[in-house]
Interface confidence: medium
């Protein structure tokens, strides 16, 4: 009974206090004295994707019935343990994390598939899965050995806005260059033709070899 009351109170405290220094030892050593221990398995190592997403399975060996299960992800770096995210779910239903949580997850029987998003190299660390069978009694607590998540930041890319400006500048430059080239070629060609020639629409051959590759102008002679 004391165990149950204590643990429920503790579970509520966990929400309020999101960072506890040196409390992992307390979890591992002190709690099992008061409550029934439960085995929790999770992979030893996971490499986050280039987009900063890491997924792993947290499996617990339920020794009794559970209608309401609470899953908490803790991050241990040095001697500091921080709560990353937590969700309580009804057995057979989906996990629901807070809207602003970096975690998502699905449940299937005694397995919880957890996904942590938005990870960066500085988030590399040991991510511990903590499972609590909240209801019905008896209360069970299980803490995994942790999953070492390695996060490698991708090679820094130029700022997308900067790339856009470069692209715009190059495009503009090419446009003005081609415009200028056309204008110069036209003016040279107009200077060389006779202004009083009469005739019909005639496709003119290039007057100068160097202009050959640039255009094939149409000359419209007028009476």
């Amino acid at each position: 009974m004391a165990c149950l009351g204590f643990q429920r109170h503790k579970a509520q405290l966990n929400l309020a206090t999101r960072t506890w220094p040196c409390t992992l030892l307390f979890f591992l050593l002190f709690i099992p004295v008061f409550c029934k221990a439960m085995h929790v398995a999770q992979p030893a190592v996971v490499l986050a994707s280039s987009r900063g997403i890491a997924s792993f399975v947290c499996e617990y060996a339920s020794p009794g019935k559970a209608t309401e299960v609470r899953v908490t992800v803790l991050r241990q770096a040095d001697s500091q343990v921080t709560e990353v995210c937590a969700a309580t779910y009804m057995m057979g239903n989906e996990l629901t994390f807070l809207d602003d949580s970096i975690c998502t997850g699905t449940s299937s029987g005694n397995q919880v598939n957890l996904t942590i998003q938005g990870l960066r190299a500085m988030d590399t660390g040991l991510y511990i899965c903590k499972v609590e069978l909240m209801y019905p009694p008896p209360y069970y607590l299980g803490i995994g050995n942790g999953t070492q998540i390695y996060v490698i930041d991708p090679e820094p890319c130029p700022d997308s806005d900067f790339l856009l400006w470069i692209l715009a500048a190059v495009s503009s430059g090419l446009f003005f260059y081609s415009f200028l080239l056309t204008a110069v070629s036209l003016s040279k060609m107009l200077k060389k033709r006779s202004p009083l020639t009469t005739g019909v629409y005639v496709k003119m051959p290039p007057t100068e070899p160097e202009c050959e590759k640039q255009f094939q102008p149409y000359f419209i002679p007028i009476n």
Epitope: G64, K65, T67, E68, M91, G92, P136, P137, P138
Partner: antibody, heavy 122, light 108 residues
């Protein structure tokens, strides 16, 4: 010996209220979750509601949600079911049953009362 | 909700015969959340089996339960006259908790 005794049933008009009681004896009432289960005439069993050993968790069947309220008074070793806005389809024998033992969490509804009849009719 | 479907609806057998009652869940139910109950006319239900296969206190050895996932079975190895009753399976894996519609075991 371990015993559950329901009371409070009777004939009531639709829309009215009724409160059922279940007196527990022979065991530590505060160590067990408690259920209400009903059985309409000639029909099967239908789970109605459950309350945890300490009263902190309460769950209901969709058919009674918002109308029925389960509660308990450990000082009196008594379980209650407050039934409001009663309908004809609530007519049934109502049983209280003891839930899983808090030490193992593995038993089913192992102790049942004899039931109390609720008839909703105009 | 999880729908529990029992079959057959009625089973007619003679004393001494073996009875096999089936219970199928519409979704997977972990075996520890499955119970069987016996109910005789005018009486309250009685717990026979919990955790799919464990006999409740005072239940004779002729009653046995088995199954996992979605299919569960209650077997009565040799029927006694007092075994003729209605049998219900029940899950408390997922809320709302649900019972099967019952199998009536009658004397042939």
């Amino acid at each position: 010996q371990v015993q559950l005794v329901e009371s409070g049933g009777g004939v009531v008009q639709p829309g009215r209220s009724l409160r059922l009681s279940c007196a527990a004896s022979g065991f530590t009432f505060s160590n067990y979750g408690m259920h209400w289960v009903r059985q309409a005439p000639g029909k099967g069993l239908e789970w109605v509601s459950v309350i945890s050993y300490d009263g902190s968790h309460k769950y209901y069947a969709d058919s009674v949600k918002g109308r029925f309220t389960i509660s308990r008074d450990s000082s009196k070793n008594t379980l209650y079911l407050q039934m409001n806005s009663l309908r004809a389809e609530d007519t049934a024998v109502y049983y209280c049953a003891r839930d899983d033992d808090i030490l193992t969490g593995l038993y089913g509804m192992d102790v049942w009362g004899q039931g109390t009849t609720v008839t909703v009719s105009s | 909700e999880i729908v529990m479907t029992q079959s057959p609806a009625t089973l007619s057998l003679s004393p001494g015969e073996r009875a096999t009652l089936s219970c199928r869940a519409s979704q997977t139910v972990s075996s520890i959340y499955l119970s069987w109950y016996q109910q005789k006319p005018g009486q309250a239900p009685r717990l026979l089996i919990y955790g799919s296969s464990t006999r409740a206190t005072g239940i004779p050895a002729r009653f046995s339960g088995s199954g996992s996932g979605t299919d569960f079975t209650l077997t009565i190895s040799s029927l006694q006259p007092e075994d003729f009753a209605v049998y219900y399976c029940q899950q408390d894996y997922k809320l709302p908790y649900t019972f099967g519609q019952g199998t009536k075991l009658e004397i042939k």
